[in-house]
Amino acid sequence: AGVFELQIHSFGPGPGPGAPRSPCSARLPCRLFFRVCLKPGLSEEAAESPCALGAALSARGPVYTEQPGAPAPDLPLPDGLLQVPFRDAWPGTFSFIIETWREELGDQIGGPAWSLLARVAGRRRLAAGGPWARDIQRAGAWELRFSYRARCEPPAVGTACTRLCRPRSAPSRCGPGLRPCAPLEDECEAPLVCRAGCSPEHGFCEQPGECRCLEGWTGPLCTVPVSTSSCLSPRGPSSATTGCLVPGPGPCDGNPCANGGSCSETPRSFECTCPRGFYGLRCEVSGVTCADGPCFNGGLCVGGADPDSAYICHCPPGFQGSNCEKRVDRCSLQPCRNGGLCLDLGHALRCRCRAGFAGPRCEHDLDDCAGRACANGGTCVEGGGAHRCSCALGFGGRDCRERADPCAARPCAHGGRCYAHFSGLVCACAPGYMGARCEFPVHPDGASALPAAPPGLRPGDPQRYL
């Protein structure tokens, strides 16, 4: 466990004559605040994915009013650091997004208005416990200068905050198998504290609070022997009685979400859905009012003038959650008809239609046959954006302009000879065969496997195919 710390040094216009006007004016005084979002750096997450490592909101900066005629200076900043606590190991490589927000303090109806001034992002390698790393980034006409570091919370140490340290019990040396804790040489590396009750014989841990089982043992505390008998249900009946294998502790076990938040598992970790009035990775931030600007992504905050009365975030299209922190996967509703591809552009939904379909939701079937003529008595058939002609007998091709050779496919079986005919084809069957395609053998006694031939047609006669 540990804390990521971000220090904003300055936010102001970039160099050069095209410097931006101050974001505040005498008529509209304003103040700045910052938001940081952290994600594991090498995750294959989409840009809109939640801040899996955590997020933080700064306090508000001092109120600033532009001095008429003066160039926009660096703007006054909030006091203190932005701190993002992390519970698990520090990943070493992380991605960040830092947003600079302006809060206008004019006489808006419904309270202050917020707007995003600048957003910077990056991916960096950073060892916990190292020195402050500095950065300078441009965002539009603005320039942001900041420093950041990750530090472990005692007793954790190390570049990933996974080793634990305890004060030495003896003045001279550490216990058996335990090394001194660099750089805290007066402390010793502590044995990991596994989940309470974890079997000392059959369980072990690589991180504090976990309980991993040796082969042949299962259960949350590794006290249940794995039996070879089959389980009756997918999870198995009560593992304590049968010894069936059950899934190990999940990320939501013990509900890491505080303040009544509900936990849902994600592919990599967990996500807390917080009740109104709370937010943060584990719903740990409370006493929030609209003055704290809790609504992200342009959400409008209503109510909550004092910490006891909850606020409500009215989210813009495409966002949801008590703080508008979750992007709605609007494509999951499959709004595009007729096989169209759905694109969520954030500000709007777009459907990329398959050929032959149009409209905002690909709902219009284009008339493929409009102005298309099929020759020689063929009829036009619509389908999937391409017109097709169903041709009259004896004709083929895309527009039924080609005279078809009905014998090209060798339709006469058993050596029968094919003759093209104005209304189709005729098969002259070889001795011993009959039928429209010479498909039936004639029995030696002269009887046919078919019902009696129509009058005037003897077995062996050419059978005309109508």
Partner: antibody, heavy 117, light 107 residues
């Protein structure tokens, strides 16, 4: 106006070292980083690393990590880049550039380094 | 390191033409892309940073767009002084990397 002026062309033998200077003027020297970028003949651009003149913190491209050194002299607003153990493939034009992590807004005129036996 | 693929690698056009050069990143780099112009024997010059911000002093006929993995540099009406090589550069991850360049020549 902002200017970055680099030292003159160099011809070196394989195995030797070269030290290129970059003198900054027209702005507060410690306010921006100085990056080094090189361009081999007819090739693209390759970032080598940067120095923060305030803290003397340096960060390098792994391709050069063990061969490059960057230093600065605040009294003359000059940054130096030294590349050791030169080989023929180090023949290139070496540029210094002012900037932060996501922009290089002013560049020096370039220094041609030729490595030949 | 993040790879940037520029296309086309060379392009012939006439004065007054509208020209588009594209740059594709091997992974999401948000809006951390810059465009540079380089003329023979000269240092590169910054044109666009953070995908669409025009550097001071750069003519407004140059514009940048895109975010994520796909980016575009557009010159709305080519001028004689625009014939040069153009490079894109990502600054999301360390080390910063450059595209292979697009050489814009007079037709």
């Amino acid at each position: 106006q902002v200017q970055l002026v680099q030292s003159g062309a160099e011809v070196k033998k394989p195995g030797a070292s070269v030290k290129v200077s970059c003198k900054a003027s027209g702005y507060t020297f410690t306010r921006y980083w100085i990056h080094w970028i090189r361009q081999a003949p007819g090739q693209g651009l390759e970032w080598m690393g940067y120095i923060n003149p305030t803290t003397v913190y340096t960060e390098f491209n792994q391709n050069f990590h063990d061969r490059v050194t960057m230093t600065r002299d605040t009294s003359t607003s000059t940054v130096y880049m030294e590349l050791s153990s030169l080989r023929s493939e180090d023949t290139a034009v070496y540029y210094c550039a002012r900037g932060g992590s996501n922009f290089f807004d002013y560049w020096g005129q370039g220094t041609t380094v030729t490595v030949s036996s | 390191a993040i790879q940037l693929t520029q296309s086309p690698s060379s392009l012939s056009a006439s004065v007054g033409d509208r020209v588009t050069i594209t740059c594709r990143a091997s992974e999401n780099i948000y809006y951390n892309l810059a465009w540079y112009q380089q003329k023979p024997g000269k240092a590169p010059k910054l044109l666009i940073y953070t995908a669409n911000s025009l550097e001071d002093g750069v003519p407004s006929r140059f514009s940048g767009s895109g975010s994520g993995t796909d980016f575009t540099l557009t010159i709305s009406s080519l001028q004689p002084e625009d014939f040069a090589t153009y490079f894109c550069k990502q600054a999301y991850d360390v080390p910063p990397t450059f595209g292979g360049g697009t050489k814009l020549e007079i037709k």
